[in-house]
C-alpha cells in the first residue's frame, strides 16, 4: 500500500480468482485512544472499533472511504483505491490502446517546435467518475523540472456505438534548451482514477522524436506568364523555432487532382517557394518537416489552383 | 579552424547534411532481424552529446564558435571509431553498398574539413571499445544510429546557420 | 571476386614461431573482421581469434592467448598470425576467413612441428 | 563457453534420401548459428547462416531451421556431391564454438 495523495492510498492486488489480497492496517488520524469506529462510504455498519483497522483487501467492495468516528464525529477519513496486476501485468482498463506508433501506445504527445513545450493526449470511453494527474520530469534518476497543467477534456466523438473521451495537458520544460542534443528523454505520468480503480501510464520520449510542425502559413500561387505553371510560396510557421537558419524546414509540395485515383505530384525543397503545374480543378498542398531530423511531418496545407 | 580561423561553413554545412541523410538511410538497414534481444547492458550512453554550455546555440556560435566546433570535432571522430568497431564491421555483415560505408567515410571527411593536417584540437579520450558479443551487436547499431541522427541533426543546424550568418 | 590467399605451407622446429599471411582481395579489407581457425589432421574446428583490420583490434579464445599474435597491414590487405613457441600440438592446418555469414575462407595453411 | 553437440557422428544414406543433421547448444543461442560443410582436403564452405537463411549458391535442398539451442539441418535429396562433414557452430557469444562434426557418407 502506499500513499497516492493526502488520505489516498493505493492498494496493489495480484488480480486472479481466490487471491488472498492485501492486508491493509488503517490508522485514525487522532489523538483520542478510545470510543473510535470505523464506517466504509456510506455505509452504518460498525466494521471494527479502535484506533487501527486491519482489512483483508481481495475485490472492489473492499476498497472505498473508510472513516473513524468519535460519538457521531468524524476523525479522518482513508480512500483506499485498488491497482490491479494480472499476470505480472498491471491493468490498462482506463484508457484506450491508441496503437500507433506500436501496440500499448496509451499516451501519445507532439511538440510544435524544440521550446520544451508539449501536448499529450489519450483517449477513454469512460465519461463519469473520472479524474487525471500528469507528473513529468527530463530524466528520471537525477529528474530535471518539467510543469505540466491540469488535464482537460478537449474533444469528444462517437466511434459506432460508443462515444470515445480524448483529454490532454501541456507541459513545459522548466530550463530547456532548444539547441542542445537532448540525452535523457521526457518522462511523462499519467495517474488515472475511475471510481475505486487505480492505473498509471507512463511515456517517454525526446522531444526531437515528437516534433511535428504546424502547417506552413501564407500559402499563395502566382501564376507565370504564357504558362500552366504557377509559383508556389509559403511561409514558415509562427510556432517553429527560431532563427530559422538554425532550425530550418523542408517541405513536400503536392499537387492533386479532384480525383483521390489521380496521379499525385510531388516536389521537394528546402526553399520556400517552388514552381509546379497546376492542373485544372487540382489543388496544391504543402507540408513541412524538419530538415535534419525525420520527425513527423505538419498537416498539408492546401490552395485551389482555380 | 583550431586556433581560431573560420571553417569552411559552406562544405560543412553540404556535408552535415549529407550526413543527416545517410544517418537516416543506414537506420533500418544494420541487420538481419528484429531486434529480439533486449540485451541492454552495453549502451551508448558514454557517447558525447552536444550539451547546453558548449556553445553552438546561435548566441554561443556568434560569441566564439570555437567551443561548439571543437565539441562537433570529438563526437564526428567518437562516432568514426564507433562506426569501425566489430560493433559494424563484425556479423551480421553490413552489405558492401550499405549506407554505414558512405556514413563512415563522410564522418571522417567532415572531421577532416573541422581540422585539417597538422592542426590538433585536444581530442576526447576515446574509450577503448571492447570487443562486442555478436548477439548485441543489432542493438548496440541500432542505439549508436539513433543517437548519430540526433548528433548530426545538431551539426547541421550549426553549420547551416553558421554558413547563413557567419561566412566571410 | 572475393579471395584470401594464405601463405605456403610451414616446416617447423619445436620452440621456434611461425607467422603466416592471408591476403584479401575483391572486397574493401577494412570493412569487415578476418578470423582464424584451427583444425587438426581428421579433427575439428577451433577459433582462435579474430582481428579488425580497421582498428587493428583483437578478441582471442582464452585457449590461444599466449600462442598466437594477430596483426595486419592495412596498405597491403593482409592479415598475419604468429604462433609462437610450438609444440607438436600446434601442428594443423590453419584457416583464415572473414565474417562467418559471408563464406570468404582461405586455402589454409598447413604447419607442421617437426624435429 | 558454449557446447555444440552434433548427432549423428556419422551417417550413411543411399541417394535421393532425406536426411536431417541435429545440432544442440548448450544453451540458447538465439538463431546466431552456422552451418558448413567440408570436403575431403577443401576448406570449410557456408550452406546456412543464422539458423535458417540461405546462402547464394548453395543447393536450395540444403535447409536450416530451429532457434534457441536446437537446430537441425535438412537434406532434401541427398546427391553424391553432398559427402563430406557437416559442421555447425556458435556465432552468438565469445569464444565461437564448433560442432564436432557429423560424417555423411553415400552407400
Known amino acids: 500500500i502506499w500513499e497516492l495523495k493526502k488520505d489516498v492510498y493505493v492498494v496493489e492486488l495480484d488480480w486472479y480468482p481466490d487471491a488472498p489480497g492485501e492486508m491493509v492496517v488503517l490508522t485514525c488520524d487522532t489523538p483520542e485512544e478510545d470510543g473510535i469506529t470505523w464506517t466504509l462510504d456510506q455505509s452504518s455498519e460498525v466494521l471494527g472499533s479502535g484506533k487501527t483497522l486491519t482489512i483483508q483487501v481481495k475485490e472492489f467492495g473492499d476498497a472505498g472511504q473508510y472513516t473513524c468516528h468519535k460519538g457521531g464525529e468524524v476523525l479522518s477519513h482513508s480512500l483506499l483505491l485498488l491497482h490491479k496486476k494480472e499476470d505480472g501485468i498491471w491493468s490498462t482498463d482506463i484508457l484506450k490502446d491508441q496503437k500507433e506508433p506500436k501496440n500499448k501506445t496509451f499516451l501519445r504527445c507532439e511538440a510544435k517546435n524544440y521550446s520544451g513545450r508539449f501536448t499529450c493526449w489519450w483517449l477513454t470511453t469512460i465519461s463519469t467518475d473520472l479524474t487525471f494527474s500528469v507528473k513529468s520530469s527530463r530524466g528520471s534518476s537525477d529528474p530535471q523540472g518539467v510543469t505540466c497543467g491540469a488535464a482537460t477534456l478537449s474533444a469528444e466523438r462517437v466511434r459506432g456505438d460508443n462515444k470515445e473521451y480524448e483529454y490532454s495537458v501541456e507541459c513545459q520544460e522548466d530550463s530547456a534548451c532548444p539547441a542542445a542534443e537532448e540525452s535523457l528523454p521526457i518522462e511523462v505520468m499519467v495517474d488515472a482514477v475511475h471510481k475505486l480503480k487505480y492505473e498509471n501510464y507512463t511515456s517517454s520520449f525526446f522531444i526531437r522524436d515528437i516534433i511535428k510542425p504546424d502547417p506552413p502559413k501564407n500559402l499563395q500561387l502566382k501564376p507565370l506568364k504564357n504558362s500552366r505553371q504557377v509559383e508556389v510560396s509559403w511561409e514558415y510557421p509562427d510556432t517553429w523555432s527560431t532563427p530559422h537558419s538554425y532550425f530550418s524546414l523542408t517541405f513536400c509540395v503536392q499537387v492533386q487532382g479532384k480525383s483521390k485515383r489521380e496521379k499525385k505530384d510531388r516536389v521537394f525543397t528546402d526553399k520556400t517557394s517552388a514552381t509546379v503545374i497546376c492542373r485544372k480543378n487540382a489543388s496544391i498542398s504543402v507540408r513541412a518537416q524538419d530538415r535534419y531530423y525525420s520527425s513527423s511531418w505538419s498537416e498539408w496545407a492546401s490552395v485551389p489552383c482555380s | 579552424v583550431p586556433g581560431g580561423s573560420s571553417p569552411a561553413w559552406t562544405q560543412c554545412q553540404q556535408l552535415s547534411q549529407k550526413l543527416c541523410t545517410l544517418a537516416w538511410s543506414a537506420h533500418p538497414l544494420v541487420g538481419h532481424m528484429d531486434l529480439r534481444e533486449e540485451g541492454d547492458e552495453e549502451t551508448t550512453n558514454d557517447v558525447p552529446h552536444i550539451q547546453c554550455g558548449d556553445g553552438c546555440d546561435p548566441q554561443g556560435l556568434r560569441d566564439n564558435s570555437q567551443f561548439c566546433l571543437q565539441r562537433i570535432h570529438q563526437g564526428l571522430i567518437f562516432y568514426e571509431k564507433l562506426l569501425g568497431s566489430d560493433i559494424f564491421t563484425g556479423e551480421p555483415s553490413l552489405l558492401p553498398d550499405s549506407p554505414v560505408g558512405q556514413l563512415h567515410a563522410s564522418l571522417l571527411g567532415l572531421s577532416q574539413l573541422l581540422q585539417p593536417e597538422g592542426h590538433h584540437w585536444e581530442t576526447q579520450q576515446i574509450p577503448s571499445l571492447s570487443p562486442s558479443q555478436p548477439w548485441q551487436r543489432l542493438l548496440l547499431r541500432f542505439k549508436i544510429l539513433r543517437s548519430l541522427q540526433a548528433f548530426v541533426a545538431v551539426a547541421a543546424r550549426v553549420f547551416a546557420h553558421g554558413a547563413a550568418t557567419l561566412s566571410p | 571476386e572475393v579471395q584470401l590467399q594464405q601463405s605456403g605451407p610451414e616446416l617447423v622446429k619445436p620452440g621456434a614461431a611461425v607467422k603466416m599471411s592471408c591476403k584479401a582481395s575483391g572486397y574493401t579489407f577494412t570493412r569487415y573482421l578476418i578470423h582464424w581457425v584451427k583444425q587438426k589432421p581428421g579433427q575439428g574446428l577451433e577459433w582462435i581469434g579474430y582481428?579488425?583490420?580497421?582498428?587493428?583490434?583483437?578478441k582471442y579464445n582464452e585457449k590461444f592467448k599466449g600462442k598466437a599474435t594477430l596483426t595486419s597491414d592495412k596498405s597491403s590487405s593482409t592479415a598475419y598470425m604468429e604462433l609462437s613457441s610450438l609444440t607438436s600440438e600446434d601442428s594443423a592446418v590453419y584457416y583464415c576467413?572473414?565474417?562467418?555469414?559471408?563464406?570468404?575462407w582461405g586455402q589454409g595453411t598447413t604447419l607442421t612441428v617437426s624435429s | 563457453d558454449i557446447v555444440m553437440t552434433q548427432s549423428p557422428a556419422t551417417l550413411s544414406v543411399t541417394p535421393g534420401d532425406r536426411v536431417s543433421l541435429s545440432c544442440r547448444a548448450s544453451q540458447s543461442i538465439s538463431d546466431y548459428l552456422y552451418w558448413y560443410q567440408q570436403k575431403s582436403h577443401e576448406s570449410p564452405r557456408l550452406l546456412i547462416k543464422?539458423?535458417?537463411q540461405s546462402i547464394s549458391g548453395i543447393p536450395s535442398r540444403f535447409t536450416g531451421s530451429g532457434s534457441g539451442s536446437d537446430f537441425t539441418l535438412s537434406i532434401d535429396s541427398v546427391e553424391p556431391d553432398d559427402v563430406g562433414v557437416f559442421f555447425c557452430q556458435n556465432g552468438h557469444s565469445f569464444p565461437f564454438t564448433f560442432g564436432g562434426g557429423t560424417k555423411l557418407e553415400i552407400k
Open positions: 582481428i579488425n583490420p580497421y582498428n587493428d583490434g583483437t
Open positions: 543464422f539458423a535458417s
Open positions: 576467413t572473414s565474417n562467418w555469414d559471408l563464406d570468404y
